[in-house]
Structures are given as C-alpha cells and as structure tokens.
Amino acid sequence: LTCLGGFASPGPVPPSTALRELIEELVNITQNQKAPLCNGSMVWSINLTAGMYCAALESLINVSGCSAIEKTQRMLSGFCPHKVSAGQFSSLHVRDTKIEVAQFVKDLLLHLKKLFREGQFN
C-alpha cells in the first residue's frame, strides 16, 4: 500500500501532457469565441520560433482583465523558465507589429499543434 500510495500522489505533469492541455485550452477559446476576444485587445507579434513560450507569455501578460485567457497565461508560465511580468519586451517580438489577441491565440494554436506533431514538448 505504501508503494501504491506513490502512484496516487500527484507528480510533475509530463511535458507532452502539459502541451496537449494547453492546445485543448486554446481550442476551447477559439471555438467558444462569441464577442471579440478580450474586447479586441492587441498584443505584440512574434517573429521567431525559439523561446516562443516566454515570448508568447510576454505578449499575453499585457492583456489584463480578460478572464478568457487567464488560464492560458497560467499554463504558458509553466513552460517559461523565468518569471514574466507585464511590460517585459523580448527580442522575439516584432516591435512595430501588434495583432488582435484572437488572431494571436489562433496562431499560437497552429504553432503548438505543429510542435506536438513533431514531438517537441518543451
């Protein structure tokens, strides 16, 4: 029983599971979208694929008061090795280019699906 107890206790979530859950959350957001997501807020676009999780979080963390993406923000923070706070700006962003949150979420979903297919879980 002592040994079996170890299986029941929650351990770290495997990266593949975490990525699948993030994809599921983004699918949820894109499918359930009725009014403009986050009142049509704009976020910085990203121009590279490396370090994408932190860059994506840096973009989305600047959207406040939007409950629809709060779970996504929390999930992305689990993929980013450093603490991200509002106002941070990564070299991965296209400084002059902002896009709508809804489009950003849709694009992020596309990219994460590709990573999942390719087995890139981190």
Epitope: S45, I46, T49, E100, K106, D107, L110
Partner: nanobody, 118 residues
Framework: GVQLLESGGGLVQPGGSLRLSCAAS????????MGWARQAPGKGLEWVSS????????YYADSVKGRFTISRDNSKNTLYLEMNSLRAEDTAVYYC???????????WGQGTLVTVSS
C-alpha cells in the same frame, strides 16, 4: 485583420529576372508555412512553391524547379520569390498565400501581375 501584400511584378523580357515580395501583417507570420501560386490568363490556379515556417524546407513545382527560389525573412514578416530565366509561359498573376493543411488558416494576397514578353 490579416493582410498579404505582393509587389515586384511587371513586364520582363524572356530570360530576364524578377523578385517578388509579400509583406505580411495581422498574424504571426513566423509560425506559418507560406507559398506562391499563380494563375495564367485563361488557366487554372497552379501552386508554384512553398516554404516551411522556419525557412528550412522548400517545395517547387516541376515547371519552375531550378529557376525559381523561395525564401523568407521572419524578422521582416516578408516572403520572397526570386524568378530567373523567365519564359513566356511564366506570365501570370502571382499570389502569396499561407500553406497550412488546416483551411481555417487560409489567407491569400490580391496578386501581382508578371508578364514575360519581348
């Protein structure tokens, strides 16, 4: 919203060269596979070339292989098509487009006309 704006078309003599550009905005260009298609007068749409999101893998139609080169600059949100040794049969409207398998990610530009004639 999403915009794909082609430029660089024009009139060129057979054997000449042109470089088409496609400026993308309103979406995360760096995460999309992209491509070029063309439509010759009175003909159907032909897929010419595509490139993956990172720019490492490319595809070319047999009709342009060895003459056309596709490339991209993700830092500039721009897709390119370098066209050399142009022939009369390359005359067409060239369209920049996303090249994703899921058609909810299907975006097209308005096109730019390339005319190869002496």
């Amino acid at each position: 919203g999403v915009q794909l704006l082609e430029s660089g078309g024009g009139l060129v003599q057979p054997g000449g060269s042109l470089r088409l550009s496609c400026a993308a905005s309103g979406f995360t260009f760096a995460w999309y596979d992209m491509g070029w298609a063309r439509q010759a007068p009175g003909k159907g749409l032909e897929w010419v070339s595509s490139i993956d999101d990172s720019g490492t893998q490319t595809y070319y139609a047999d009709s342009v292989k060895g003459r056309f080169t596709i490339s991209r600059d993700n830092s500039k949100n721009t897709l390119y098509l370098e066209m050399n040794s142009l022939r009369a049969e390359d005359t067409a409207v060239y369209y920049c487009a996303t090249a994703e398998r899921d058609d909810t990610y299907d975006y097209w530009g308005q096109g730019t006309l390339v005319t190869v004639s002496s």
